[in-house]
């Protein structure tokens, strides 16, 4: 039950995260005009990954797309790439995780297959979240660098008399949406990976009881039946090793005071 809840919650958190990454990528407010300590302008500039916009105090808003590909800064291209990779991985992860959900029955899909799919989607969500966080952080770093550069020469004097105000840009809403969304996707991915551990039917090489005896001895189940190695071979005169951790179904295989003859 806990596994199903963890998986379901991981799916929902990742879904919200990926929706947020998509929203952030499409948003125009990645960088917004810094209004602090600036002359009050009747024009507000803001920029996204795909276009830049100007909102006038009259209410008129005009947005222009970046129609050039080669003319754009390499950093912007890198951020675009990271966000798109994040979205693509996240979308594939969502698709995979839908089929991996324990509450959804698809044919005769085994738990091991669901576990693998859960792990795959979890890893995809983690990478998707990291891509988004990296993309947003790269853009934020670019803004900080440009901000201090433009602050250094906030007013560039022209002929001593005329002044040109340099527009400074600060963090836009999309950055915060991106950080939160990336974090949620990452958390969702981790939850899916945790759920995968609980889903996996933990296979053992030998389902017999391990014990050490001085003479010829045989391991018996309480019903008097000879314990099996899992391969149908005789256990007489052999040291039998447990192949690892057991599932709940194997509990009766543990030695008890009745197991020795």
């Amino acid at each position: 039950m806990a596994v199903t809840a963890c998986q379901g919650l991981g799916f929902v958190v990742s879904l919200i995260g990926i929706a947020g990454i998509i929203a952030a990528t499409c948003m125009d407010q990645w960088s917004t005009q810094d209004l602090y300590n600036n002359p009050v302008t009747a024009v507000f500039n803001y920029q996204g990954l795909w276009r830049s916009c100007v909102r006038e105090s009259s209410g008129f808003t005009e947005c222009r797309g970046y129609f050039t590909l080669l003319g754009l800064p390499a950093m912007l291209q890198a951020v675009r790439a990271l966000m798109i990779v994040g979205i693509v991985l996240g979308a594939i992860g969502l698709l995979v995780s839908i089929f991996a959900l324990k509450c959804i029955r698809i044919g005769s899909m085994e738990d091991s297959a669901k576990a693998n799919m859960t792990l795959t989607s979890g890893i995809m969500f983690i990478v998707s979240g990291l891509c988004a966080i990296a993309g947003v952080s790269v853009f934020a770093n670019m803004l900080v660098t440009n901000f201090w550069m433009s602050t250094a020469n906030m007013y560039t004097g022209m002929g001593g008399m005329v002044q040109t105000v340099q527009t400074r840009y600060t963090f836009g809403a999309a950055l915060f949406v991106g950080w939160v969304a990336g974090g949620l996707t990452l958390i969702g991915g981790v939850m899916m990976c945790i759920a995968c551990r609980g889903l996996a039917p933990e296979e053992t090489n030998y389902k017999a009881v391990s014990y050490h005896a001085s003479g010829h001895s045989v391991a018996y189940k309480p019903g008097g039946f000879k314990a099996s190695t899992g391969f149908g071979s005789n256990t007489k005169n052999k040291k039998i090793y447990d192949g690892g951790a057991r599932t709940e179904d194997e509990v009766q295989s543990y030695p008890s005071k009745h197991d020795y003859v």
């Epitope: 302008t41 009747a42 500039n45 008129f60 022209m158 040109t164 105000v165």
Partner: antibody, heavy 118, light 113 residues
Framework: EVQLVESGGALVKSGGSLRLSCAAS????????MSWIRQTPEKRLEWVAT????????YYPDSVKGRFTISRDNAKNTLYLQMSSLRSEDTAFYYC???????????WGQGTLVSVSA | DIVMTQSPSSLTVTAGEKVTMSCKSS????????????LTWYQQKPGQPPKLLIY???TRESGVPDRFTGSGSGTDFTLTISSVQAEDLAVYYC?????????FGSGTKLEIK
Amino acid sequence: EVQLVESGGALVKSGGSLRLSCAASGFTFSNNAMSWIRQTPEKRLEWVATIIIGGTYTYYPDSVKGRFTISRDNAKNTLYLQMSSLRSEDTAFYYCARQVYGNSFAYWGQGTLVSVSA
Amino acid sequence: DIVMTQSPSSLTVTAGEKVTMSCKSSQSLLNSGNQKNYLTWYQQKPGQPPKLLIYWASTRESGVPDRFTGSGSGTDFTLTISSVQAEDLAVYYCQNNYFYPFTFGSGTKLEIK
């Protein structure tokens, strides 16, 4: 057709108060930034106040800040200018204008005269 | 505050002549975001309120005759009337629409001989 009709202009004593109104029609009033501009007897144009869409922000020049208040009633399609502590230099023709693209004033009313006597 | 300086303060021309008037701002009115200059030109005929002629320094308002042309960028702007008509008798004002407070030039009075 866009129409802006100002009213409320009068002769007032220095230090007095006055409220100007501007009735708007022919456009969606609530979707536009509105302004008051005055023209002095020397024919100089002076921007007095601007209220943006929604009325959340208002802007004034230092010469009237704290004395004049621009407001709007979108339900009545009316723009107001509350003037207090009037001075002789406030004597002017007051125009109400609709702000459009480029923050320019595309539509102006016919104006109302405010005279402040010493 | 931004100071808008217009020159000449008045000019007298004959009908059909080409007229240019200048407007200078104390700070650049060019917005880097959209590469537009927030300067507006108005025409005020006697006994009338001002009428919008040109916005964004060079965009003609609809209904304005194409003999009116705005040009310039940054701090220096010009209004040109290619062939003056008798009905162009008016005072022409330029305005800063970029910085608050919005400021107007003192005007250029155009008179016809």
